[in-house]
Amino acid sequence: MAVTACQGLGFVVSLIGIAGIIAATCMDQWSTQDLYNNPVTAVFNYQGLWRSCVRESSGFTECRGYFTLLGLPAMLQAVRALMIVGIVLGAIGLLVSIFALKCIRIGSMEDSAKANMTLTSGIMFIVSGLCAIAGVSVFANMLVTNFWMSTANMYTGMGGMVQTVQTRYTFGAALFVGWVAGGLTLIGGVMMCIACRGLAPEETNYKAVSYHASGHSVAYKPGGFKASTGFGSNTKNKKIYDGGARTEDEVQSYPSKHDYV
């Protein structure tokens, strides 16, 4: 039950995380115009991974796509790539995890197969979350660098009287959405990996083994180790695994001088 809950919760958390990563990637507010300590303008600028927008005080908003590919900064391209990889991996992970869910029956799928699929989707979610966090962090670092560079020469004098105000950009809402979403996807992935351990076939799940002695039989109840007297084949207290243990119907013991009551 706990395994199913962990797996289900991991799936839901990852689903929310990936939805968040998609939302962050599509959002226009990755960087927003810094309003602090800036001359008050009637225009507000903000930028996303795919386009930049300007909102006038009149309410009019105008967005322009980055129609060039080669002209864009390498860092922006890298962030785009990381976010897309994160989305793709997350989407595949979601698809795999749906079939891996314990509560969903698909034919006669073995628990071991479900465990492997759960682990696979968990790893995919972890990598997806890391990609998103990395992408957002790279962009944030880029913003911080540019912010201080533009602060250093915020007012570039032009012939004494005339001044040009440089627009500074700070963290936009998409960055926080991306960080949270990446974190959720990561947590969901970890939960899936934990659930995978519980889904794997139990190694301590044994069947009762009985031995037939001459005249009467002594049945041994399953317990981690077989009771040993120092005789027989299990002299070293080896663990009896499911694969090796055989049932009463399968094994017929023959009388021996070592039989005991």
Epitope: Q33, P39, V40, T41, A42, V43, N45, Y46, Q47, S52, C53, V54, E56, S57, S58, G59, F60, E62, R64, V162, Q163, T164, V165, Q166, T167
Partner: antibody, heavy 119, light 113 residues
Framework: QVQLKESGPGLVAPSQSLSITCTVS????????VSWVRQPPGKGLEWLGV???????NYNSALMSRLRISKDNSKSQVFLKMNSLQTDDTARYYC?????????????WGQGTSVTVSS | DIVMTQSPSSLTVTAGEKVTMNCKSS????????????LSWYQQEPGQPPKLLIY???TRESGVPDRFTGSGSGTDFTLTISNIQAEDLALYFC?????????FGSGTKLEIK
Amino acid sequence: QVQLKESGPGLVAPSQSLSITCTVSGFSLSNYGVSWVRQPPGKGLEWLGVIWAGGNTNYNSALMSRLRISKDNSKSQVFLKMNSLQTDDTARYYCARHGYGKGNAMDNWGQGTSVTVSS
Amino acid sequence: DIVMTQSPSSLTVTAGEKVTMNCKSSQSLLNSGNQRNYLSWYQQEPGQPPKLLIYWASTRESGVPDRFTGSGSGTDFTLTISNIQAEDLALYFCQNAYFYPFTFGSGTKLEIK
């Protein structure tokens, strides 16, 4: 069609306050910003302040302490209240609408109301 | 506050001529986000309220004759009126629509001979 009409007292005594109402038609104040501009006789234009669609205001820094702009969307009215009037506040007061997608420019103006500050 | 300086303060021309008037701002009115200049031009005929001619420094308001052309970027702007007509007798103002407070130039008075 778009119309703006100012209505004011005409004559105001020095140190008194001025209240002007701008009644608009043909558009909604919940979608457009309205500015107040004045023009002293024979002089240029002076921007006083603006109230945007969302209700946020910006004022001329020189007049900020004695100026207040408000509006009533349901009545399609914008109000200008100015305190401590002096003789140099004598001017024609205009209200003007900020066009949408026109670079914050004022695309429609009222005819203005003349205000004389005199004892 | 942004200072808008207009020159000349007055112009006298004959009908059919071409005229240019200048406007200079103390800070750049160019917004880097959309590469637009937030400068407007207004025409005020005697006894009338101002009328919008040009916004974004070069975009003509609908209904404005194409004889009126706005140009310039950053801090230096120009309004050109070609083939001047008698009805163009008016005051022309430039306005900063980028920084608060919005400020107007002192105006250029256009007179017809």
